[in-house]
């Protein structure tokens, strides 16, 4: 038996006797893009669609975190027949479209990268007008941001039994190795990754007992560099510390 199907959204007039190919989109994105903090990165995304010579209104969207539901970081819209995709959203002004959606290219440039940008990004395109269709990549592209270590906090805090302890927190990617040095210390405590802070780039090391006055130095190192910071412990009246 013969079936004739007119499906406006799939823009298809199709006579089928048994089975027919499904009208499907396809998106091509790399698994990962790597770039250094402070630099720019390009997130490539190209697509194919089943609609011949689509010239109607379209919207290009990038979102972060998770497909279909993550927050949008970039959005632009092109009017019928136009090759100019007018930016409607660019988070912090750091995202801009490099590709031409009319030529099936949604590639995005991200400026002034920070470690917080290290996540997965998903491209999406929407057709409107005569053809009403859309597609979003499920896999997305992982943006891997690398950075030399930076010590973001070093402090001396009260500890048990009138003692003091020191904390050093650093960020970097790859996650830095931390070491303490100071009076009567060899190479100090092990670094403990922080619990649930930031995007997994924070590492904290604790020196549980500062037994001597003097200078205590925290050193952070990864394959991209090293950083150090110091605190000074002086005990007055047996109870307080100045740093």
């Amino acid at each position: 038996f013969v079936r004739t199907k007119i499906d406006t959204t799939e823009n298809l007039l199709n006579t089928e006797v048994h089975s027919s190919p499904v009208q499907r989109w396809s998106m091509q994105v790399p698994a990962e893009v790597s770039a250094a903090a402070g630099d720019a990165a390009v997130l490539p995304c190209t697509f194919t669609h089943p609609h011949r010579h689509y010239d109607g209104p379209l919207t290009a969207i990038w979102r972060a975190g998770e497909p279909y539901a993550g927050p949008q970081v970039f959005r632009c819209a092109a009017a019928r027949g136009s090759e100019l995709c007018q930016t409607a959203l660019s988070l912090h002004g750091r995202f801009r479209l490099l590709g031409n959606p009319r030529r099936n290219d949604l590639s995005l440039r991200v400026e002034r990268l920070a470690l917080a940008d290290d996540r997965r990004y998903f491209c999406r395109v929407e057709f409107a007008g005569d053809v009403h269709d859309r597609y979003e990549s499920r896999h997305g592209v992982r943006l891997h941001v690398t950075a030399a270590p930076r010590i973001i906090n070093i402090s001396v805090l009260p500890g048990p039994a009138h003692a003091f302890r020191a904390l050093c927190t650093t960020e970097g990617e790859p996650p830095p190795a931390l070491a303490w040095s100071g009076p009567a210390l060899g190479n100090g405590s092990a670094a403990v990754p922080s619990s649930g802070q930031g995007h997994g780039h924070l590492v904290t090391a604790e020196l549980p007992a500062l037994n001597h006055d003097g200078r205590y130095t925290c050193t952070a190192a990864n394959s991209l560099g090293r950083s150090e910071a110091s605190v000074y412990l002086f005990r007055f009246h047996g109870a307080s510390a100045s740093t």
Epitope: D7, T8, T9, P21, V22, R24, R134
Partner: antibody
């Protein structure tokens, strides 16, 4: 979280029409995707019946085309299956499922059992 | 229609064993866009099917890495590297490259 829930009569007489409802929560059926009906016969054979897309267009299994209709109520975020002229061969567990762009069913209802008997 | 044929119908295993299920399509399910829309589902008694693998070899979110899919053209395989009790049930392959979409007849994974 996305949830789908089928509801229907349970029993239908031969030659009558069957109407099933799928209520979707946690996601708008007009936002994205295709919303499918799939049935499972006694003995476990699964059969895809058809879908309604976010846009409202439908695609049906050719052998069911003469008696199937899938529609929706966007205000209630529901979509429906109507199957006409049922026979005992239509006795099955009926599932609704969300199909994403890569042709996969990522969310299913728990199923509703339909028996066609006189 | 594209006929999906699964073998074996029943697969008795011991916990910790490897398991392999085959699925063959009656025509190629390579889509013209370069993708192959071949998925695997597991249905446990009294439950709806749950997605394991999509587009031949991609594990769905939350699916343990002991599940893997492979194949091309008309021949596809699902492998379970170390069977656990929670893996028991009926496995179905599914093609979404051609209308009508079609499922395999199912393979029951059960304890030996």
């Amino acid at each position: 979280d996305v949830q789908l829930q089928e509801s229907g009569p349970g029993l239908v007489k031969p030659s009558q029409s069957l109407s099933l409802t799928c209520t979707v929560t946690g996601y708008s059926i007009t936002s994205d995707f295709a919303w499918n009906w799939i049935r499972q016969f006694p003995g476990n054979k699964l059969e895809w019946m058809g879908y309604i897309r976010f846009s409202g267009s439908t695609t049906y299994k050719p052998t069911l085309k003469s008696r199937i209709s899938i529609t929706r109520d966007t205000s209630k975020n529901q979509f429906f299956l109507q199957l006409n002229s049922v026979t005992t061969e239509d006795s099955a567990t009926y599932y609704c499922a969300r199909e994403d762009y890569d042709g996969l069913f990522d969310y299913w209802g728990q199923g509703t059992t339909l028996t066609v008997t006189s | 229609d594209v006929l999906m044929t699964q073998t074996p119908l029943s697969l008795p295993v011991s916990l910790g064993d490897h398991a392999s299920i085959s699925c063959r399509s009656s025509q190629t399910i390579l889509h013209s866009n370069g993708n192959t829309y071949l998925d695997w589902y597991l249905q446990k008694p009294g439950q709806s099917p749950k997605l394991l693998i999509y587009k031949v070899s991609n594990r769905f979110s939350g699916v343990p890495d002991r599940f893997s899919g492979s194949g091309s053209g008309t021949d596809f395989t699902l492998k379970i590297s170390r069977v656990e009790a929670e893996d028991l049930g009926v496995y179905y392959c599914f093609q979404g490259s051609h209308v009508p979409y079609t499922f395999g007849g199912g393979t029951k994974l059960e304890i030996k």
